[in-house]
Interface confidence: medium
């Protein structure tokens, strides 16, 4: 019922940016289920995130990324939920269900070409990597109340008011003093009184929904998570300073104990569940380069070992407007020589914590094909091929000539439009075959094209083993075998008797056996047998055999 | 055979709310991902959210990000799709679709295999 696929493929045109984003994510659970229609599957990655380009991207300052890079992530549970082992959470995958391929054309496919760029390094977190991803959505840290602003100045000097101010940091309700004037211009200081003052929320309550980004310094290799709150808050045993917690191990959890004068007890206690280090990972080019022109292969691979729970990581991409949710991804229908950027990000317990950008070039194709001009022999021995270039890249050219079974190639200069064959046999016939080459990650041969000449005809080579034998006194056998070159279309063999220098007998068979009779004994004569192709006759073999005296 | 039955569709004042449901039924199969489409006469199948069924991750196009919710009910054998706010341009028919295998980009209808019938949802101004 879905649309059939354009056969376009994907187009590298310029495309608007892409309508998908994603929702705050839920704590990561897996339930079991009966088995149903919609079931888990057998998969490597468990939980994806979506990509979201029209949100606030994150920016890093290029001097941070000499030591440190930055990640976002949010909704830090506090409470982390058991992961509960079923079969599909099975580190191993199942054969091929780890890799994404696009293979087709969806109409609303569209990949973007990135003019001019160099590849970008695969390494997470070097300058050269471009981040396009989004920073997670921030939940609210504090409750803004809406309070409506009176004028004081408008009301009576006998009215006490009782004035209530939001303390946007705090987020609670304090009394206040209020100065008002009277319509005399006196200053009239009234006493705010209010009978309760609203109690103040628990820091569990109001670091509910806290997140935190993740700093990794590539030296130490060790991680610091800034809190994103607006108030300078309290961590028990000093595990923080300015917000920040410090010297965090990749894969262990770290309990913190968060407070602060604007709420009270219970503290909120937040589990940092630290992620790998950020330089185990490397986004791999896995493209075969048999098929680099139109395919793009890219997938993360873990370079060095970590305790993290692998399950609890997933990997999403984008490439145009297409999103991938695997650890593998696969592009197909490609055009060759073309930029194509994919942007690609790996979460922990489904908070991202580190990207990467490629910027991939696909090979040089397969060039086009030769428009073959004119092909023909206007001689016996030589050839002639004329030809305009293909339209695509190509290195040189190779020439084949086959006549039979034998083939012949040559390998010609891209700058040549025409070769004349030399030294060919004649009156056969030359099948050519003219492709295009390239050598790129391999070499790529375009398609051949093909064209045909006969050679003229020359004169054929000697007809050879030639015998003259008496059968009687004055009859003679003559034989020979073909010439080994006919070098025509036809095949006569003659045979010329000379006695002196007059030509006695002049015979003409389709092959050479030619019994000649009646010829005079005791005499000399010269026997010239040659072939004749029907444009040329050969080179005579002459023999010269007498007759005997007449027995009788 | 394999089933999907999408319910919930209707007639909805502008600003009023939706909740549309999909049941899977017949034989069992391995869904990598459900997800929402709409399409209105004349054009072409609009992908709205998708969730993935090992997980439960969730993608929304732009237009309805914030006020649709896309959830799964793994015992019920159920993906709802809850929809707030509505806006006249939501009106359309709504289809529930189904990838066994997803090999192609999940936001595209040609990556998905079984598909409902479809459920007219109308906003009125």
């Known amino acids: 019922q879905s649309p059939t696929p354009s056969p376009t493929g994907l187009t590298t045109a310029k495309m608007p940016s892409v309508p998908l984003s994603s929702d705050p994510l839920p704590t990561h659970t897996t339930a079991f289920s009966p088995a149903s229609t919609f079931e888990r599957e057998n998969d490597f990655s468990e939980t994806t995130t979506s990509l979201s380009p029209d949100n606030t991207s994150t920016q890093v300052s290029p001097d941070s990324l000499d030591n440190a890079s930055a990640f976002n992530t949010t909704g830090v549970s506090s409470v982390q939920t058991p992961h509960l082992p079923t079969h599909a959470d099975s580190q191993t995958p199942s054969a091929g269900t780890d890799t994404q391929t696009f293979s087709g054309s969806a109409a609303n496919a569209k990949l973007n070409p990135t003019p001019g760029s160099n590849a970008i390094s695969d390494v997470p977190g070097e300058r050269s990597t471009a981040s396009t991803f989004p920073t997670d959505p921030v939940s609210p840290l504090t409750t803004t109340l809406s309070l409506a602003h009176h004028s004081s100045a408008a009301l009576p000097a006998r009215t006490s008011n009782t004035t209530i101010t939001a303390n946007t940091s705090d987020a609670y309700l304090n009394a206040s003093e209020t100065t008002t004037l009277s319509p005399s211009g006196s200053a009239v200081i009234s006493t705010t009184t209010i009978a309760t003052t609203p109690s103040k929320p628990t820091c569990d309550e109001k670091y509910a929904n806290i997140t935190v980004d993740y700093l990794y310094n590539k030296e130490t290799k060790l991680f610091t998570a800034k809190l994103n709150v607006n108030e300078n808050v309290e961590c028990g045993n000093n595990t923080c300073t300015n917000n920040e917690v410090h010297n965090l191990t990749e894969c262990k959890n770290a309990s913190v104990s968060i407070s602060h004068n604007s709420c009270t007890a219970p503290d909120k206690t937040l589990i940092l569940d630290v992620p790998p280090g950020v330089e185990k990972f490397q986004l791999h080019d896995c493209t075969q380069v048999e098929k680099a022109d139109t395919t793009i292969c890219l997938k993360w691979k873990n370079i060095e070992t970590f305790t993290c729970d692998t399950q609890n990581i997933t990997y999403r991409f984008q490439c145009g407007n297409m999103i991938f949710d695997n650890k593998e991804i696969k592009l197909e229908n490609l055009e060759p020589e073309h930029e194509y950027k994919c942007d690609s990000e790996i979460l922990y317990n489904n908070h991202k914590f580190t990207n990467a950008s490629k910027i991939i070039k696909t090979d040089f194709g397969s060039p086009g094909e030769p428009q073959i001009i004119f092909c023909r022999s206007e001689a016996a021995h030589q050839g002639v091929i004329t030809w305009n270039p293909p339209q695509r890249s190509f290195h040189n050219f190779t020439l084949c000539y086959i006549k039979e079974t034998e083939k012949d190639c040559l390998n010609l200069d891209k700058n040549l439009i025409k070769y004349d064959l030399q030294n060919l046999k004649p009156y056969t016939k030359y099948v050519l075959s003219l492709h295009a080459y390239i050598i790129a990650k391999v070499q790529r041969n375009g398609s051949a094209a093909m064209c045909h000449f006969t050679t003229k005809s020359a004169p054929p080579s000697q007809v050879w083993n030639m015998t003259v034998s008496m059968t009687s006194d004055n009859s003679m056998h003559v034989k020979c075998r073909p010439p080994r070159d006919r070098n025509g279309p036809h095949e006569r063999y003659h045979l010329e008797v000379e006695a002196g220098n007059t030509l006695v007998r002049n015979e003409s068979h389709k092959n050479c056996d030619f019994r000649v009779k009646d010829l005079q004994y005791s005499t000399d004569y010269t026997f010239k047998a040659y072939f004749h192709n029907g444009d040329y006759p050969g080179e005579p073999f002459i023999l010269h055999h007498s007759t005997s005296y007449n027995s009788k | 055979e394999v089933q999907l039955v999408e319910s919930g569709g209707g007639l909805v004042e502008t600003g009023g709310s939706l909740r549309l449901s999909c049941a899977g039924s017949g034989r069992t199969f391995s869904s990598r991902h459900v997800g929402w489409f709409r399409q209105t006469p004349g054009k072409e199948r609009e992908f709205v959210a998708s969730?993935?069924?090992?997980?439960?991750?969730?993608y929304y196009a732009d237009s309805v990000k914030g006020r649709f919710t896309i959830s799964r009910d793994n015992g019920k054998n159920t993906v709802a799709l809850q929809m707030n706010n509505l806006k006249p341009e939501d009106t359309a028919v709504y289809f529930c679709a189904a990838a066994v295998r997803l090999t192609a980009p999940l936001n595209f209808d040609t990556s998905y295999d079984y598909w409902g019938q479809g459920t007219q949802v109308t906003i009125s101004s």
């Open positions: 969730i993935r069924w090992s997980g439960g991750h969730t």
